[in-house]
């Protein structure tokens, strides 16, 4: 603890200029003090003044006011400093002392004489109210004050509290009364050595050196650190934890950068015509009458749906066409006969059957033969019937479909899978990508089937946590961790709820 | 009693960057109410604080030696580290880790025994 | 940069008092630590907030600290203090020794 115990003389009165041996002083009684100050006791006693003691010079003669002085000789009020903890009660001893001699240090004069003593035992507090006293005897009074502050960076009731303020490393606050601290703004903790961190900043992604900043670990993003950062490449996906892609929708692959939805993303059908989705990247235009072309994009002409019956010619016309009709029909598409079976109108050994009491008829044609009066040689290609750009091949009585590669099905309907070849070596997986299949491999080859053998082995060390598979191949050099149910992350170190939907690439 | 243990090579070529870890133990690194600091002291010379962390990860450093100097923690490993970049001879040091105490007002009570650390071609 | 300036040297008998000073711009409004730090070994700190010793360090060893300076004070030195002792101080957010003193 650190003190200073304040004595302040106020007035001391001698109106007779006497001695306390009843002498009188000649001229006057040139007046100081001597004042010892030590711990308590019942019955004061000569010995060290065990708490401090203090001389004056010459502050006056016979009776005299004493006025504050801070500085110089004569200090008012005199200061008696301690090391220790102030224990709260005290013996106080004020003598008054003549001196013939250097007015200021008359301790050192012969001569000097005791005018009067007074002697305080008590209690006291350690603050900032003086107490105030006045002693009478017969010849002298005394009035004085007195009380017990802390030195600089000193609290408590007894002045044993040490606080600096302070504004650095270990602490940012300043003292209260009491001796407790008291933190600056932008700081907490017991001793204000912790920063508060920018409003909303996340307690477990963000922390900050300063107040009022906001510093992201690893993974996270964003003023408040409360945006997960996906995986590298992640184009069309989003994460919940750090490093994670899981593809909006319509979208798929590793990186979301597979296009699920063409149909919808690129509206490559043409004309009215309707898309469907067939694999990434891969869609099927269905044409409405009158247009062909993989995304329907060609006009047919308006003859090419043969609308004229009864072998009517077809002419084309501006938005329409026209049907030039042979003998014996009419009407828009020659439709209506003004033959009846008399006139022998089924070709290719059609049957003539009577209507309509003989005033028409219908031909029951032979197979491969078709049209009113069975004039048309039967073309099953007429109606399109393969999809996905397929040819179309008349053979005899049927037709078939010469699918493009990667279609198959009776109508080329079917998308192949570019992994059905198993065109991954040494048990390599396959995965159907935009641009044809990829191999993941099994530890110890690479290469795009999976054909080579490596020497190092990316997977040796055991990148892949919680029972990971680890695999090489899927990208030059590299490794891929295939996470068991539970856990995601390039080496499956992040738990979660979630299945992962795909392996990580390392 | 905490106890920490410098670790790391005692060689280093200039220009290169010198990486050293302190391991601690009889104690959590995360423990609130500690900085976890170095210092180092060339061959015969004084001592220099480089800097220190906080378990939360907040960083200090001395300006002197800011553009160069990188500490970390790994909490799950009650390790941490020290990475100084375009080393030359002038950095030549006993290398001591060292816990700060906040309720010692800094003072650090806690030393590792140090490791030369010596930048040579 | 904040600067701590140290004798180099303080001779005493055994038995004497050894005072070490340390100084520095308002250094009585910054706490300080001592260390002592024997040949071949890593430092002890013997004094924190100026004048507070940690446990197991003897009563012999005070310090003081106002206005410019700083002050350890060993009182009945013996031979085990002979020793290099530096002083230490926080400027805002960086760490600062004082040059070190040898007392022989």
């Known amino acids: 603890g650190s003190g200073i115990f304040q004595l302040r003389l106020q007035e001391f009165v001698n109106q007779r200029g006497m001695l306390a041996n009843g002498q009188s002083c000649e001229p006057g009684c040139r007046t100081f003090f001597r004042i010892c100050l030590k711990h308590f006791q019942a019955t004061f006693s000569e010995g060290p003044c065990t708490f401090g003691n203090v001389s004056t010079p010459v502050l006056g003669t016979n009776s005299f006011v004493v006025r504050d002085k801070n500085s110089g000789s004569g200090r008012n009020p005199l200061q008696l400093p301690f090391n220790f903890t102030w224990p709260g009660t005290f013996s106080l001893n004020i003598q008054a002392w003549h001196t013939p001699g250097d007015d200021l240090r008359p301790e050192t004069s012969p001569g000097n004489s005791l005018i009067s003593q007074i002697i305080i035992q008590g209690s006291l507090a350690v603050g900032k109210i003086w107490r105030t006293d006045e002693q009478n005897d017969t010849l002298t009074r005394l009035s004085y004050s007195y009380r017990v502050i802390c030195s600089d960076n000193y609290y408590g009731e007894s002045c044993s509290r040490l606080c600096k303020k302070r504004d650095d490393h270990f602490g940012h606050y300043e003292c209260q009364p009491d001796g407790s601290l008291s933190c600056l703004p932008g700081w907490t903790g017991k001793y204000c050595d912790q920063p508060i961190c920018l409003s909303g900043c996340h307690e477990q992604n963000g922390y900050c050196s300063k107040p009022d900043e906001c510093i992201c670990r690893p993974g996270w993003q964003g003023r408040l650190c409360n945006e997960c950062i996906p995986h590298n490449g992640c184009r069309h996906g989003t994460c919940s934890i750090p490093w994670q892609c899981a593809c909006d929708e319509g979208w798929g692959g590793l990186f979301c950068d597979q296009d699920l939805n063409y149909c919808t993303h690129h509206s490559p059908c043409k004309n009215g015509s309707t898309c469907s989705n067939s694999g990434p990247k891969g869609y099927t235009c269905t044409c409405l009458p009158g247009y062909t072309g993989e995304h329907c994009e060609l006009g047919l002409s308006k003859c090419a749906s043969n609308p004229c019956r009864n072998g009517g010619s077809c002419k084309d016309q501006e938005n329409s066409y026209h049907c030039l009709c042979p003998p014996g029909y009419y009407g828009q598409h020659c439709e209506h006969s003004t033959l009846t079976c008399a006139d022998s109108p089924c070709f290719n050994g059609g049957s003539c059957r009577e209507r309509n009491q003989g005033s028409s008829y219908a031909c029951e044609c032979p197979p491969n033969f078709t049209g009113s009066n069975c004039e048309k040689k039967v073309d099953r290609c007429t109606s399109n019937p393969c999809a996905n750009g397929g040819q179309c091949q008349n053979r005899g009585p049927s037709r078939t479909c010469r699918c493009r590669p990667g279609f198959t099905g009776t109508h080329c309907e079917l998308h192949i899978s570019d992994c059905a070849r198993s065109p991954c070596a040494h048990g390599g997986t396959c995965h159907d990508l935009e641009n044809g299949p990829v191999c993941t491999c099994p530890a110890g080859f690479s290469g795009r089937r999976c054909e080579v053998r490596i020497t190092h082995d990316a997977c040796a060390s055991g990148p892949c946590f919680n029972g990971a598979t680890c695999y090489t191949g899927l990208s030059p050099n590299n490794f891929v961790c295939n996470c068991p149910y539970g856990f995601v992350g390039s080496r499956c170190e992040f738990p979660v709820g979630l299945p992962p939907s795909f392996p990580w690439v390392a | 009693e905490v106890q920490l243990q410098e670790s790391g090579p005692g060689l280093v070529k200039p220009s290169e960057t010198l990486s050293l870890t302190c391991t601690v133990s009889?104690?959590?690194?995360?423990?609130?109410?500690?900085?976890w600091g170095w210092i180092r002291q060339p061959p015969g010379k004084g001592l220099e604080w480089i800097g220190d962390?906080?378990?939360?990860?907040?960083?200090y450093y001395n300006p002197s030696l800011k553009n160069r100097v990188t500490i970390s923690v790994d909490t799950s490993k009650n390790q941490f580290s020290l990475k100084l970049s375009s080393v030359t001879a002038a950095d030549t040091a006993v290398y001591y880790c060292?816990?700060?105490?906040?309720?010692?007002?800094?003072?650090?009570?806690?030393w590792g025994q140090g490791t030369l650390v010596t930048v040579s071609s | 940069s904040y600067e701590l300036t140290q004798p180099p040297s303080v001779s005493v008998s055994p038995g004497q008092t050894a005072s070490i000073t340390c100084s520095g711009e308002?250094?009585?409004?910054?706490?300080v630590s001592w260390y002592q730090q024997k040949p071949g070994q890593s430092p002890v700190l013997v004094i924190y907030e100026d004048s507070k010793r940690p446990s197991g360090i003897p009563e012999r060893f005070s310090g003081s600290n106002s206005g410019d300076t700083a002050t350890l004070t060993i009182s009945g030195t013996q031979a085990m203090d002979e020793a290099d002792y530096y002083c230490?101080?926080?400027?805002?957010?960086?760490?600062?020794f004082g040059s070190g003193t040898k007392v022989t």
């Open positions: 308002s250094l009585g409004d910054k706490y």
């Open positions: 230490q101080a926080w400027d805002g957010e960086t760490g600062v």
């Open positions: 009889g104690g959590s690194i995360s423990s609130s109410g500690y900085y």
């Open positions: 060292a816990r700060e105490e906040v309720i010692l007002g800094g003072g650090a009570d806690q």
């Open positions: 962390i906080y378990y939360t990860g907040n960083t």
